[in-house]
Interface confidence: medium
């Protein structure tokens, strides 16, 4: 029977800069029941606080609700593992909420084949930003990436859409059924998961772009 091994805070993520969650990996348990606690202070302050919510983020997590989340301050946090034989501490982790944002996937993806009479046909797609993100505040710039592939193909073709919530693609294989998805990321932060997908059938008479 030994003191617990050293835990590690391995990930912190925020969906929208208003709340965030951190997760840790326990070290070895030393063969005894082990209790974990996360403590933190804001950089420049000495007052230590305990994690406000160990439940919302699931096992081995700490969730910071709106009232505990401050965009303009760096959080310094560590996890303490304790059993009957002793304690061990994780390394300190410095967290700036601005840099840990991972949004939900974009919403409402729809795809259409457009065949204007006077121009080459194209694939047109549109989507909406995730609902948790308020773009009107100016706190966020969301960037989008599209991926598509013929249904049976292994490789995805990706297109960067910038800040647009619609996009056109001209070079497609006639007669193929394509699978299309979109994801987003803030200017500082992580890519979201890919959105739910949309299948689109490209007509056999679709004229390839020169």
């Amino acid at each position: 029977q030994l003191p617990p091994g050293k835990p590690e805070i391995f990930k912190c993520r925020s969906p929208n800069k208003e709340t965030f969650t951190c997760w840790w990996r326990p070290g070895t348990d030393g063969g005894l029941p082990t209790n974990y606690s996360l403590t933190y202070h804001r950089e420049g302050e000495t007052l230590m606080h305990e994690c406000p919510d160990y439940i919302t983020g699931g096992p081995n997590s700490c969730h910071f609700g709106k009232q505990y989340t401050s965009m303009w301050r760096t959080y310094v946090m560590m996890v303490n593992a304790t059993n009957q034989m002793g304690s061990s501490f994780s390394d300190e982790l410095y967290v700036d909420v601005t840099y840990i944002v991972q949004p939900d996937p974009p919403l409402e993806l729809t795809v259409e084949v457009k065949q204007p009479e006077d121009r080459k046909p194209y694939l047109w797609m549109k989507w909406s930003p995730p609902t948790l993100i308020d773009l009107k505040t100016g706190w966020f710039t969301l960037l989008y990436e599209i991926r598509l592939k013929p249904e049976k193909a292994a490789e995805w073709e990706t297109h960067f859409a910038g800040q647009q919530t619609e996009f056109k693609i001209l070079s497609l294989h006639p007669g193929q059924k394509y699978l299309v998805q979109v994801r987003c990321k803030p200017d500082h932060g992580y890519w979201s998961a890919w959105s739910p997908a949309t299948f689109i059938q490209i007509p056999s008479d679709f004229i390839m772009n020169d």
Partner: antibody
């Protein structure tokens, strides 16, 4: 509270065009992450998804029926309209509209209308 | 399009039984799988969404599990009001598809 109500003809002749209206209350058709779907169910058979329209006006259709379907919405009237051309007796079914809810990693139909039975017969 | 295969197509059970219905997708749908209950002459009612999230107001005897291609709806202790048809539906890819349904009947 949220309600949806389908309206339209109960009897349609073969080759005619069916127009169904879904009138909603308790939410707005322009609310982000909301939409309306149409689903049908022939007597004694399974549910079949037909089309949907999202708050951003994006539309999607059943692959097999795409050439016959058009979905549109009038946000101010709180209505979604589905038209289906060239009706056939096999299109006899109860037609439902339902609210689409999109959220964090979820996409589902949380409120349904009571349905309207459409019979196609000469 | 993605195909959804439900099994069994019907089953007979008694009040208090544990009932399991499975749904298989023809390709991975992550966890974008919803379950609905439908009683004769009524509209379907949402039970679970995103494979395992219980819709508000639905009794806790209903639970869901699975991800990728294989999903399960479980009724832990069947009640008289649970005799109905159950449908799975994928919302991972448009066009959306429903399973063919499972009718739960009284033994």
């Amino acid at each position: 509270q949220v309600t949806l109500k389908e309206s339209g003809p109960v009897l349609v002749k073969p080759t005619q065009t069916l127009s169904l209206t879904c009138t909603v209350s308790g939410f707005s058709l322009s609310d982000a992450g909301m939409g309306v779907s149409w689903i049908r169910q022939p007597p004694g058979k399974a549910l079949e998804w037909l089309a949907h329209i999202f708050s951003n006006d994006g539309k999607s259709y059943s692959t097999s029926l795409k050439s016959r379907l058009t979905i549109s919405k009038d946000t101010s009237k709180r209505q979604v309209v589905l038209t289906m051309t060239n009706m056939d007796p096999v299109d006899t079914a109860t037609y439902y509209c339902a609210r689409i809810r999109t959220g964090t990693y979820s996409l589902y139909l949380d409120y349904w209308g009571q349905g309207t039975l459409v019979t196609v017969s000469s | 399009d993605i195909q959804m295969t439900q099994s069994p197509s019907s089953l007979s059970a008694s009040v208090g039984d544990r009932v399991t219905i499975t749904c298989r997708a023809s390709q991975s749908i992550n966890s974008y799988l919803n379950w609905y209950q439908q009683k004769p002459g009524k509209a379907p009612k949402l039970l679970l969404y995103f494979a395992s999230s219980l819709q508000s107001g639905v009794p806790s005897r209903f639970s869901g599990s699975g991800s990728g291609t294989d999903f399960t709806l479980t009724i832990s202790s069947l009640q008289p009001e649970d005799f109905a048809s159950y449908y799975c539906q994928e919302s991972y890819s448009t066009p959306w598809t429903f399973g063919q349904g499972t009718k739960v009947e009284i033994k």
